[in-house]
């Protein structure tokens, strides 16, 4: 099923969203820190 319909599951999507959210938080934090240091 490597090329089938089951390659885009909700559980996989949720994990991707969690990673995106985490990265956005980390990058946002770094950006705020950079602005603060200026």
């Amino acid at each position: 099923h490597s090329d089938g319909i089951f390659t885009d599951s909700y559980s996989r999507y949720r994990k991707q969203m969690a990673v995106k959210k985490y990265l956005a938080a980390v990058l946002g934090k770094r950006y705020k820190q950079r602005v603060k240091n200026k």
Epitope: D3, I5, F6, S9
Partner: antibody, heavy 115, light 109 residues
């Protein structure tokens, strides 16, 4: 924001053709499994078919060669080409994301086949 | 063709009732790819449960799913006013096809 917006529905004569569009935002259609699902007035949901990341398409037996699913990666848009339309194709057509389970849905677009 | 049989087709219930809807498939679903949806008139379906028993994000805990193979159940432990709607099951199959149940309308008794 993750969103799907269908367009292209309307009134079409029996035997005619129509192409529906589904514009995605918040994710890329080329890496997702995208589907078309329809619902005739007062009836249940019916899966039409799917397109997977590789571009391979899968269809319900009821689609019987009259319906074609495609996508334009540059426009992040999914399409449903419908040919030789019949009165029984009158329905709200939804696009939805997910493989075997539909976790993001558009608002739907109504297609009416009538003379 | 694969048949997804949902029962009952209509269910009359009161607020606070425990409600159970069943979905039977003529063929075993692939890797428990059985999902449930709620639909209100004029609206798109809402994703409730995935892989038979997992609650989608934001779905109240009064909803639960169970089952495997060919027999599945959706339960609402205590029916709320917002829950009066039509519910559909959908199964994913190894042939890369999807089938929907006929729907169950939950109406006010």
């Amino acid at each position: 924001e993750v969103q799907l917006v269908e367009s292209g529905g309307g009134l079409v004569q029996p035997g005619g053709s129509l192409r529906l569009s589904c514009a995605a935002s918040g994710f890329t259609v080329s890496s997702a499994v995208m589907n078309w699902v329809r619902q005739a007035p007062g009836k249940g949901l019916e899966w039409i078919g799917s397109i997977v990341a590789s571009g391979t398409t899968y269809y319900a037996s009821s689609a019987n060669g009259r319906f074609t699913i495609s996508r334009d990666n540059s426009k992040n848009t999914l399409y449903l080409q419908m040919n030789s339309l019949r009165a029984e194709d009158t329905a709200v057509y939804y696009c939805a994301r997910g493989g075997g389970e539909f976790f993001i849905w558009g608002q739907g677009t109504l297609v009416t086949v009538s003379s | 063709d694969i048949q997804m049989t949902q029962s009952p087709s209509t269910l009359s219930a009161s607020v606070g009732d425990r409600v159970t809807i069943t979905c039977q498939s003529s063929e075993s679903v692939y890797s428990n790819y059985l999902s449930w949806y709620q639909q209100k008139p004029g609206k798109a379906p809402k994703f409730l449960i995935y892989q038979a028993s997992n609650l989608a994000s934001g779905v109240p805990s009064r909803f639960s799913g169970s089952g495997s193979g060919t027999e599945f159940t959706l339960t609402i432990s205590s029916l709320q006013p917002d829950d009066f709607a039509t519910y559909y099951c959908a199964g994913g199959y190894s042939e890369n096809i999807v089938g929907f149940g006929g729907g169950t309308k939950v109406e006010i008794k």
